[in-house]
């Protein structure tokens, strides 16, 4: 499937719903639809409280039944393994695809785990992670943070992805901020052109 590299903050902000959950088994084809659904057991909701309303949890994650339509294929057989799932909410159901941000919770860095729980939300609607996939690239706005992991690391899983969030420094300026113990340290030259 044609998936653009995504910074975890972008995945968080662009998703209707972000949860921690366990996959309980093989997918079930939904007759007369293009969907299949995985039974899941939600352990924690990280985003989507407003959208969900009174719903106490999600029992299923829906995905296209065909890989050619970006269906998600869950490969892990470990039912006790917890996953971070960032998806869309449609008709009260959680929808995921092969492009969804969906990773084992333990694969996230401690900084990312912390950010999904409480930090990324501060940048949503205010700041934008701007991917730099080819040099030269420059910021188009002071509310953008230049994401250079793909160029510097050759992968979307790099230092900015693992340890930084794009957060408001003041009402008109967003900068990369370190997700370590102190939330006040900025990445040097965060606003410079690459």
């Amino acid at each position: 499937c044609s998936c653009a590299p995504t910074h975890p903050q972008t995945a968080f902000c662009n998703s209707d719903l972000v949860i921690r959950a366990k996959f309980m088994g093989s997918p079930e084809i939904i007759e007369t639809t293009l969907y299949q659904r995985y039974e899941i057991k939600m352990t924690k909701m990280l985003k989507g409280f407003d959208a969900v309303g009174n719903a106490t949890g999600f029992r299923f994650a829906y995905t296209p039944a065909m890989e050619s339509l970006c269906g998600y294929v869950h490969k892990s057989q470990n039912r006790s393994e917890e996953f971070l799932i960032a998806g869309r909410l449609r008709n009260g159901n959680l929808h995921i695809t092969a492009c969804s941000f969906l990773v084992p919770w333990h694969n996230l860095s401690p900084a990312q785990q912390k950010a999904f729980v409480k930090t990324y939300s501060a940048g949503c609607g205010v700041c934008t992670v701007f991917p730099c996939s080819a040099i030269p690239c420059k910021l188009e706005s002071d509310s953008h943070c230049l994401w250079t992991d793909q160029i510097l690391m050759g992968s979307e899983k790099g230092y900015q992805s693992d340890h930084f969030a794009c957060l408001p420094r003041n009402p008109d300026l967003c900068t990369w901020q370190y997700l370590g113990v102190s939330m006040t340290r900025s990445l040097p030259l965060a606003k410079a052109e690459a």
Partner: antibody
């Protein structure tokens, strides 16, 4: 029964882009997939890509990766296919098709002519 | 990608004769994801057979599909004048959708 109505014929210059629309009526637009298929003069059918509007993620044939963008607007029940960096070989009839585990309903086709 | 090879490229027959069209896949395809289409000049394709053997709504009983794995067949038991057209097989099984190159059924 679903009906798919496509936008009209286009004549484009090499290097430019074209955006073809496909409006659906009847059925639940968001829940099924829309695929795009093209057919060059005298040639066979070629799948370009598809999207399920409710999921919002498109998949593209390897051949068209980076040149084609398929989107869907749930509010107007319309799917779009944009092809960029056009060349003369892109002259073809472009079809949208409702997709289940087969293509059960087709648009009337849109002729795109690329000529300098 | 899964490659579908149709044979023959052209089939010259007379009305009333039986037509047998072949579609061979480069790797095994689930029958659920194999379809056949008919296309006439200047028209959009029309679904004939889905799931390898199920006739689409409104398709006459003279059309039938069979096969599994890598070999699939479309049979027209007795050709009517309106059946002379080009026929395509299609698979939606893998990460990509592919069509065969087509078989043209022409009047002998």
């Amino acid at each position: 029964q679903v009906q798919l109505v496509q936008s009209g014929a286009e004549v484009k210059k090499p290097g430019s882009s074209v955006k073809v629309s496909c409006k659906a009526s009847g059925g639940t637009f968001s829940s099924y997939a829309i695929s795009w298929v093209r057919q060059a003069p005298g040639q066979g059918l070629e799948w370009m890509g598809g999207i399920i509007p409710i999921f919002g993620t498109a998949n593209y044939a390897q051949k068209f990766q980076g040149r084609v963008t398929i989107t869907a607007d749930e509010s107007t029940s319309t799917a779009y296919m944009e092809l960029s960096s056009l060349r003369s070989e892109d002259t073809a009839v472009y079809y949208c098709a409702r997709t289940y585990y087969y293509f059960d309903s087709w648009g009337q086709g849109t002729l795109v002519t690329v000529s300098s | 990608d899964i490659v579908l090879t149709q044979s023959p490229a052209t089939l010259s027959l007379s009305p009333g004769e039986r037509a047998t069209l072949s579609c061979r896949a480069s790797q095994s395809v689930s029958s659920s994801y194999l379809a056949w289409y008919q296309q006439k000049p200047g028209q959009a394709p029309r679904l004939l057979i889905y799931g390898a053997s199920s006739r689409a709504t409104g398709v006459p009983a003279r059309f039938s599909g069979s096969g599994s794995g890598t070999d699939f067949t479309l049979t027209i038991s007795s050709l009517e004048p309106e059946d002379f057209a080009t026929y395509y097989c299609q698979q939606l099984y893998g990460t990509s959708v592919t069509f065969g190159q087509g078989t043209k059924v022409e009047i002998k």
